[in-house]
């Protein structure tokens, strides 16, 4: 029961996490900065992985997509790649984990197969979460680096003066969504891996058994202690014990009245 709960919870947590990673990837608010402020209106810019928008306090919004790949920072491309890899791995993980769920019966799928699938999906969720966390962290680092590098300066441009305006960059909502979603996916993956251990069929347990001789000169039957395979009559690893003394020749003979199972 605990295994099913752990697996189910891991699946749900990962599902929420991956939905969050998708949401963060699509969001425009990865970074925000104030562009202009006066008593009448304020203009701020928010930028995502795919487009940049300018919004005014009046509600007017204008967005433009990044149609060229050449002019974009390499770091942005890296973040895009990390987020997409995270989404793809997460989606595959979800698909695999649906079939691995203990509460869902598909044909005559053995527990060992379900355990393997659970482990596979768990690892996929962990990698997916790490990709998202890495992507968001790389972006956050890029923002901080750009902010400190963009010191206010003035120079002569084409047909007049150009002045860099020192604006305050702030982390957008998408960064926090991405961090939380990545963390949830990671936690979900760990839960799936934990559930996998409980799903795996138990290996043969060779328990130590103490033998007590009934007489002074006792010979034990070779192979008298059988390991259980989970099938057949001896399912509880019971001792096959011979209390009487036998000669070497008698060992292979049919069971006597002294033998009991």
């Amino acid at each position: 029961m605990a295994v099913t709960a752990c697996q189910g919870l891991g699946f749900v947590v990962s599902l929420i996490g991956i939905a969050g990673i998708i949401a963060a990837t699509c969001m425009d608010q990865w970074s925000t900065q104030d562009l202009y402020n006066n008593p009448v209106t304020a203009v701020f810019n928010y930028q995502g992985l795919w487009r940049s928008c300018v919004r005014e306090s009046s509600g007017f919004t204008e967005c433009r997509g990044y149609f060229t790949l050449l002019g974009l920072p390499a770091m942005l491309q890296a973040v895009r790649a990390l987020m997409i890899v995270g989404i793809v791995l997460g989606a595959i993980g979800l698909l695999v984990s649906i079939f691995a769920l203990k509460c869902i019966r598909i044909g005559s799928m053995e527990d060992s197969a379900k355990a393997n699938m659970t482990l596979t999906s768990g690892i996929m969720f962990i990698v997916s979460g790490l990709c998202a966390i890495a992507g968001v962290s790389v972006f956050a680092n890029m923002l901080v680096t750009n902010f400190w590098m963009s010191t206010a300066n003035m120079y002569t441009g084409m047909g007049g003066m150009v002045q860099t305006v020192q604006t305050r960059y702030t982390f957008g909502a998408a960064l926090f969504v991405g961090w939380v979603a990545g963390g949830l996916t990671l936690i979900g993956g760990v839960m799936m891996c934990i559930a996998c251990r409980g799903l795996a069929p138990e290996e043969t347990n060779y328990k130590a058994v103490s033998y007590h001789a009934s007489g002074h000169s006792v010979a034990y039957k070779p192979g008298g202690f059988k390991a259980s395979t989970g099938f057949g009559s001896n399912t509880k690893n019971k001792k096959i014990y011979d209390g009487g003394a036998r000669t070497e020749d008698e060992v292979q003979s049919y069971p006597s009245k002294h033998d009991y199972v």
């Epitope: 562009l35 009448v40 007017f60 750009n146 305006v165 020192q166």
Partner: nanobody, 121 residues
Framework: QVKLEESGGGLVQAGGSLRLSCVAS????????MGWYRQAPGKQRELVAT???????HYADSTKGRFSISSDNAKNAVALQMNSLQPDDTAVYFC???????????????WGQGTQVTVSS
């Protein structure tokens, strides 16, 4: 980079009108705000009027009611209609654009070379 082309300056009698125009060209991601500033001889550059892409306008106290700013977003153009001009409106008028050129970089203020407006009494 952004290039600003100004036109419409000249000499005008007090009480007269003039219309200044400015067109922004070049490669940029966004234009946040366009506007006009002026600089009289021996004085600091001061705000005349600004307009955002959404049409929100802001005027200096000295130009309110007399000057009117308008823009054409499709052409990235801004115009300043100046009425009831006075001798103390004499100055070099500069077109200004605050634009974003690069992704994840701060905006730049671009200035035109200026157009002379002289109001004679």
């Amino acid at each position: 980079q952004v290039k600003l082309e100004e036109s419409g300056g000249g000499l005008v009698q007090a009480g007269g009108s003039l219309r200044l125009s400015c067109v922004a060209s070049g490669s940029f991601l966004h234009i946040a705000v366009m506007g006009w500033y002026r600089q009289a001889p021996g004085k600091q550059r001061e705000l005349v009027a600004t307009i955002t892409r959404g049409g929100a306008t802001h005027y200096a106290d000295s130009t309110k009611g007399r000057f009117s700013i308008s823009s054409d977003n499709a052409k990235n153009a801004v115009a300043l209609q100046m009425n009831s001009l006075q001798p103390d409106d004499t100055a070099v008028y500069f077109c200004n654009v605050r634009a974003l050129i690069k992704v994840f970089h701060p905006p730049n203020d671009y200035w035109g070379q200026g157009t002379q407006v002289t109001v004679s009494s």
